[in-house]
């Protein structure tokens, strides 16, 4: 006799909404065996029994999860394998908090996953990452874990949160950040991943109180093309509203693009400047608020923004488009930016 | 001079409440994370709460959890620990310190308060 | 919850000894680690972060190693005011967690 399950494994981990076949099948010298499946749920799945052979078909629903057993049985002789088959959600639906990050600012970072099953500590793992590393000396906050709203009744599916407080990213900064979210499951490890760019900028604000031998201190070989004169900010080749930044955007490669600084002789007004070639002009496209409440002054290749009335920048987002191409520079000004004094 | 000083302690009933106090001097206390530990009496260090400087994160120790309210008041340069409920075991000296911005260890300490929970 | 323990739970020494103290976490807490001094009474006072770093103000005599789950707090020269409670504390993730404590008594 010869008593076989396939596949063959105790365990099997199926992904919630596909289909799955167990068959077992026994061979018998005296006869037919007799084969069959015990130990299901009214809802496991179902059963489909031939001549020395059943087959179990799960359809991939969460309520699926069990222990059956098939049992055969020839003569006098009996045989039976179980397998526990266990139903998992983990579609690639990473969300990351902030969607980039400032060096020099002690900041949280949180990447969740959504719509996830089981929503075990010891099956889900989060790493932040620099490159293939894990980001050294982050420090982990409390994990959250929350029921997600669900459209239909059912086993409800979960969604996990991990956050992190920063440490100082150096200078250079690392282009991006990762958060991976790794699940382990029987004989099976499925990894999602996000990015979370980092911000570049020339003048990165220092962190508070730091000595000269901390640890720690990432660095960085990646390096951004930014103009950022006089002001304490940061600019950004990038399409609105927030930057997604990779490694061959911070170089100075790919189309030509407008700059951004501090037109030192005007005190607080912002220039964007385009030197690709004749008959290009640029235009402010985005600032924090109301743009129409700022003045403009545009000439071609040139255009000014200044505050009304005259007063400190305001901090958020700034951006100027280059036409034709459509190319765009992002830059941001943080809160409370001292400029140089202008004589 | 950065220091920090707790104030509130005293003598509780089972089942009281009290509220702890930390004053802090000596550096910008919003741009900090706080703590409170304890040390019950003959006992090793316990976390219980953290905040961060704009109040935007708390977390609590299973022990205290549901029980015990971390709070700041950045212009008055505070830290409070609302304690209710308070049980035997919440007997101890506790201290607030301060979490050191991108490296997280507690680098102040203050000189603690005591709290005594008994009928 | 990571668990902090702390070899041994106390020590006899004398003045001028070389003392060691070591504190293994439950899982790695990378160099996530500081050490902490206890008079009766007192408050703890940080003398070494990130495993191995130096607090401002702490001699020299005082240093620390290690990283992932092993580490160890050195003094290499026992002084009569480093009779205290040491403690080890990691800081990777919370709950940030202590270990038991080491009692350094006068032998």
């Known amino acids: 006799q010869s008593f076989q399950v396939n596949p063959p494994e105790s365990e099997v981990a199926v992904a919630m909404g596909t289909s799955l076949q167990i068959t077992c099948s026994m061979s018998c010298d005296e006869g037919v065996a007799r084969v069959h499946w015990r130990g299901l749920d009214t809802s496991l799945g179902s059963v489909q029994t031939l001549p020395g052979s059943s087959i179990l078909s799960v359809r991939g629903m969460l309520s699926d999860t069990g222990t059956p057993v098939c049992v055969g049985s020839c003569g006098s002789r009996s045989f039976q394998h179980s397998v526990k088959i266990l139903v998992y959600a983990f579609p690639d639906q990473l969300v990351v908090s902030p969607e980039f990050l400032v060096p020099g600012q002690d900041q949280v970072v949180s990447c969740t996953a959504h719509n996830i099953w089981p929503a075990d500590p010891n099956s889900l793992s989060f790493a932040l990452l620099l490159g293939e590393q894990r980001l050294e000396g982050a420090q982990a906050l409390e994990p959250e874990q929350e029921e997600e709203i669900q459209e239909a009744e059912g086993t409800p599916l979960f969604r996990m949160t991990q956050r992190w407080r920063l440490p100082s990213l150096g200078t250079p900064a690392p282009p991006a950040l990762h958060c991976q979210v790794t699940m382990q499951l029987p004989k099976l490890v499925l990894t999602h991943r996000k990015e979370i760019p980092v911000l570049q900028s020339q003048t990165s604000p220092k962190p508070p109180n730091t000595t000269s031998a901390e640890p720690y201190i990432l660095t960085s070989s990646s390096t951004a093309e930014a103009v950022s004169t006089g002001l304490n900010i940061t600019t950004l080749p990038s399409a609105p509203p927030y930057p997604k930044l990779s490694p061959r955007t911070l170089s100075s490669e790919g189309p030509c693009r407008p700059k951004i600084h501090q037109d030192l002789e005007a005190g607080w007004e912002l220039l964007c400047e385009a030197s690709c070639g004749p008959g290009v002009t640029v235009r402010w496209t985005l600032a924090p608020g109301d743009l129409a409440t700022y003045h403009k002054r545009e000439a071609g290749a040139q255009a000014w923004l200044s505050v009304l009335p005259p007063g400190p920048m305001v901090e958020g987002w700034f951006q100027c488009r280059q036409d034709p191409g459509g190319e765009v520079t992002n830059l941001y000004v943080p809160g409370q930016v001292t400029p140089n004094s202008s004589s | 001079e950065v220091q920090l000083l707790e104030s509130g302690g005293g003598l509780v009933q089972p089942g009281g409440s009290l509220r702890l106090s930390c004053a802090a001097s000596?550096?910008?206390?919003?741009?900090?994370?706080m703590h409170w530990v304890r040390q019950a009496p003959g006992k090793g260090l316990e976390w219980i709460s953290y905040i961060s400087g704009d109040s935007g994160y708390t977390n609590y120790a299973d022990s205290v959890k549901g029980r015990f309210t971390i709070s700041r008041d950045n212009s008055k340069n505070t830290l409070y620990l609302q304690m209710n409920s308070l049980r035997a075991e919440d007997t101890a000296v506790y201290y607030c310190?301060?979490?050191?911005?991108?490296?997280?260890?507690?680098?102040?300490w203050g000189k603690g308060t005591t709290v005594t929970v008994s009928s | 919850d990571i668990q902090m323990t702390q070899s041994p739970s106390s020590l006899s020494a004398s003045v001028g000894d070389r003392v060691t103290i070591t504190c293994r976490a439950s899982?790695?807490?990378?160099?996530?680690l500081a050490w902490y001094q206890q008079k009766p009474g007192k408050a703890p006072k940080l003398l070494i972060y990130?495993?191995?770093s130096l607090q401002s103000g702490v001699p020299s005599r005082f240093s620390g190693s290690g990283s992932g789950t092993d580490f160890t707090l050195t003094i290499s020269s026992l002084q009569p005011e480093d009779f205290a409670t040491y403690y080890c504390q990691q800081y990777k993730s919370y709950p940030v967690t202590f270990g038991q404590g080491t009692k350094v008594e006068i032998k």
């Open positions: 310190a301060r979490d050191r911005p991108y490296y997280y260890y507690m680098d102040v």
């Open positions: 000596g550096f910008t206390f919003s741009d900090y994370w």
């Open positions: 990130a495993a191995s």
């Open positions: 899982q790695s807490v990378s160099r996530s």
